[in-house]
């Protein structure tokens, strides 16, 4: 039995950050847990790590040098991330594992979220106005 | 006037445990997040751990990650950093920092430290 | 992690003298870089974040430049209170670091 996630098929990143939502067809609450987001059509980067067992607190970390955040509704993680690069344009997949209680379960490949980083662009300057006729 | 104080420091034996608290006043404590930065003696710093603004999530530096543990009382103003099974490279003075929920990790307003000494 | 590597380790000036520190990154961190002053016995205290912007009180003397992978911290001319140790600290990437410092110190 696989758990199902839902994402957004396409994000925006205006100011080098974005919201992802991570819903799934499953209740994290009092459950312990690992929801990850990765990076690539391969998933090769895991981007965000968001543990929660049954305390409040979510854990988060990213071994691969990604500023993130994690929010968790009773079906859904929130993965925030901040200070993206215009380079780091890709897919992103959504990621669940449920550890307890048993059995174990994890997702079928959800169908990933493209992440567009905008550069941010000066407005240009206006033409330095001639004199004034008289 | 932002203020941070941070207590609870002290002599502690390899393996001990220690609770750290950091009182915030002057400023709207529940709108930043507030962070755990270490100096051991002579040396640099070196960032520890961050609570998010509503204490619903937390990271740690790999060197603490399932030893110290991070909260805060809203209500109270204040931030607390849990020590456990405690090792003599913990030895440090430890600051409490704010951050702003936007930039979370852009350090503003810093406590003056409290120093702990982890020796047999 | 990203390694911040600021040079020199020690500045020896005089009052009145400009002092330049540089803080280079081991990869790009865009333009979030900061810089905070620390004295002995003291914390930290925040002197430029975003690697140009200047906190709340800081005075103009002190002026950040740079992005990417190469950054500057330049004092002016150094009043007294100056003499400490400055330190560099990056927030684009997870975990956030910091340099090992600079101290300035009167010649």
């Known amino acids: 039995n696989k758990i199902l996630v839902k994402q957004s098929p396409m994000l925006v990143a205006y100011d080098n950050a974005v919201n992802l939502s991570c819903k799934y067809s499953y209740n994290l609450f009092s459950r312990e847990f690992r929801a990850s987001l990765h990076k690539g059509l391969d998933s090769a980067v895991e981007v965000c790590v968001v543990y929660g067992n049954y305390s409040q607190q979510l854990q988060v970390y990213s071994k691969t040098g990604f500023n993130c955040d994690g929010k968790l509704g009773n079906e859904s993680v929130t993965f925030y991330l901040q200070n993206l690069y215009v380079n780091q344009t890709d897919i992103y997949f959504c990621k669940i594992e449920v550890m307890y209680p048993p059995p174990y379960l994890d997702n079928e490949k959800s169908n990933g979220t493209i992440i567009h980083v905008k550069g941010k662009h000066l407005c240009p300057s206006p033409l330095f106005p001639g004199p004034s006729k008289p | 006037e932002v203020q941070l104080v941070e207590s609870g420091g002290g002599l502690v034996q390899p393996g001990g445990s220690l609770r750290l608290s950091c009182a915030a006043s002057?400023?709207?404590?529940?709108?930043?997040?507030m962070h755990w930065v270490r100096q051991a003696p002579g040396k640099g710093l070196v960032w520890v751990s961050r609570i998010n603004n509503d204490g619903s999530s937390a990271s740690f530096a790999d060197s603490v990650r399932g030893r110290f543990t991070i909260s805060r009382d809203n209500a109270k103003n204040t931030l607390s950093l849990q020590m456990n099974s405690l090792r003599a490279e913990d030895t440090a003075v430890y600051y409490c920092?704010?951050?702003?929920?936007?930039?979370?990790?852009?350090?503003?307003?810093w406590g003056q430290g409290t120093l702990v000494t982890v020796s047999s | 992690e990203i390694v911040l590597t600021q040079s020199p380790a020690t500045l020896s000036l005089s009052p009145g003298e400009r002092a330049t520190l540089s803080c280079r990154a081991s990869?790009?961190?865009?333009?979030?870089l900061a810089w905070y002053q620390q004295k002995p016995g003291q914390a930290p205290r925040l002197l430029i974040f975003?690697?140009?912007n200047r906190a709340t009180g800081i005075p103009a003397r002190f002026s950040g430049s740079g992005s990417g992978t190469d950054f500057t911290l330049t004092i002016s001319s150094l009043e007294p209170e100056d003499f400490a140790v400055y330190y560099c600290?990056?927030?684009?990437?997870?975990?956030?670091?910091f340099g090992q410092g600079t101290k300035v110190e009167i010649k």
């Open positions: 600290q990056q927030r684009s990437n997870w975990p956030p670091t």
């Open positions: 975003d690697a140009s």
């Open positions: 920092a704010r951050a702003d929920s936007s930039s979370w990790y852009h350090f503003d307003y």
């Open positions: 990869q790009s961190v865009s333009s979030y």
């Open positions: 002057g400023f709207t404590f529940s709108s930043y997040w």
